[in-house]
Amino acid sequence: GELETSDVVTVVLGQDAKLPCFYRGDSGEQVGQVAWARVDAGEGAQELALLHSKYGLHVSPAYEGRVEQPPPPRNPLDGSVLLRNAVQADEGEYECRVSTFPAGSFQARLRLRVLVPPLPSLNPGPALEEGQGLTLAASCTAEGSPAPSVTWDTEVKGTTSSRSFKHSRSAAVTSEFHLVPSRSMNGQPLTCVVSHPGLLQDQRITHILHVSFLAEASVRGLEDQNLWHIGREGAMLKCLSEGQPPPSYNWTRLDGPLPSGVRVDGDTLGFPPLTTEHSGIYVCHVSNEFSSRDSQVTVDVLDPQEDSGKQVDLVSAS
């Protein structure tokens, strides 16, 4: 006869491990007992369980409540046992010793490998600001056994660096993603991807990039100066900028207070029917936590009558 077992049994932390040991004997041979022991190198054998043909299953005190026989139907030549709720400390070498009649004793060893799936964590780096050099965007750490693989999935251009720390029964891997911040990266996903044999599928943690910036400010509304004449209604100036975080807007008049009746509505300055009092230099002040910008324009409200007089004069002068 001969013993059938596995060289390696792999199980995920918390799952039940089946330790196989099957005696393939000749007809008429009987198994008297199967003794299981843990036999790690450098340590004495530690008894695990005994499957006895007459007495049944004995579980040694160290494994009380954790070792069972596989569910029926059971073959009397099958000495396999189930180790319930495998923990990392269970990883190691195991031996089954089978006492048979009349063939004698046989033994076989297997290695139990307990996979510890990682629980990854992603930590964003310091606040990203346009104009910075190479900056840490995020770091991702995962600890497991064996060491997990940590990679990045993103459209953003950057560089990665990884380091590993070995512990007694596991390894922690940290990967960092560095980039040169630019406003085009705003809102882009940066995904940490963790692979491990104990995971059914890769674990992914996504971080949305936020890059602080403030664009140059400009004012729209004066494209056609001829529209800015006395009596015109609905005239307005709009301040144009963009930023992260979204900026706030403030309007002032350089050469005095804002005229009465002028309405400030965020980025827009609304005028009542135009008078010459509305002529002046207007300043749009744009700011966010990152920076501030100014843009100024000169409003010159035309008097159509003065204009026509001038034209006549000009004509007559010619």
Epitope: G32, Q33, A35, E47, L50, H52, K54, Y55, G56, L57, H58, S60, P61, R97, S99, S105
Partner: antibody, heavy 126, light 107 residues
């Protein structure tokens, strides 16, 4: 025929010592685990100690640990129990017994006691 | 330690009676249980091992059953030589422990 014969019992004062012997015959002594079991007058059975054939595994009941020592001489087919610091509650008939040898190389379990000696009485009294 | 509780502690019966003695373990012991018979002034004698296996030379009127925590010794037809004290013993763990005994007396 399997035979186990105990000797060495007697009257001893509290704190005294006694050495019991058990002569075995009719079987291959060096193949079997051997135990001592005692029985106080009018009481039930209490396991005392066990020793494996090579002497590499020994165990004791908590009540005698540190006071009693089990040993064996396979060349003489003899089992011993050295009893020190004896107390009144150690008064009992002491039996040596052979363990049934149907469990191989597994120390966490004991096996039934299939042969017993006739016993020797130990009386601890002042 | 595993506690073994026998019941009854004593019983009176007549020759030819069917006698049942029970033994309960404080935790599961599979079939690691033996039954012994002891007569006054004599050493115990192994009757049953592995809960239900009859020791060589023991009359077939003795039988054992049970597994886990509850066990039974049955004498199918009590004979005069069967009046004695009976002990159960677990050998699942060290120390092996005995029940307190059941004395079978003549009615």
């Amino acid at each position: 025929e399997v035979q186990l014969v105990e000797s060495g019992g007697g009257l001893v004062q509290p704190g005294g010592s006694l050495r019991l012997s058990c002569a075995a015959s009719g079987f291959n002594f060096s193949d079997f685990d051997m135990s001592w079991v005692r029985q106080a007058p009018g009481k039930g059975l209490e396991w005392v100690s066990v020793i494996k054939p090579s002497g590499d595994y020994i165990n004791y009941a908590d009540s005698v640990k540190g006071r009693f020592t089990i040993s064996r001489d396979n060349s003489k087919n003899t089992l011993y129990l050295q009893m020190n610091s004896l107390r009144a509650e150690d008064t009992a008939v002491y039996y040596c017994a052979r363990e049934y040898s149907d469990v191989v190389d597994y120390v966490s379990v004991r096996t039934p006691l299939d042969y017993w000696g006739q016993g020797t009485l130990v009386t601890v009294s002042s | 330690d595993i506690q073994m509780t026998q019941s009854p502690s004593s019983l009176s019966a007549s020759v030819g009676d069917r006698v049942t003695i029970t033994c309960r373990a404080s935790q599961g012991i599979s079939s690691y249980l033996a039954w012994y018979q002891q007569k006054p002034g004599k050493a115990p004698k192994l009757l049953i091992y592995a809960a239900s296996s009859l020791q060589s030379g023991v009359p077939s009127r003795f039988s054992g059953s049970g597994s886990g925590t509850d066990f039974t010794l049955t004498i199918s037809s009590l004979q005069p030589e069967d009046f004695a004290t009976y002990y159960c013993q677990q050998h699942y763990t060290t120390p092996p422990t005995f029940g307190q005994g059941t004395k079978v007396e003549i009615k």
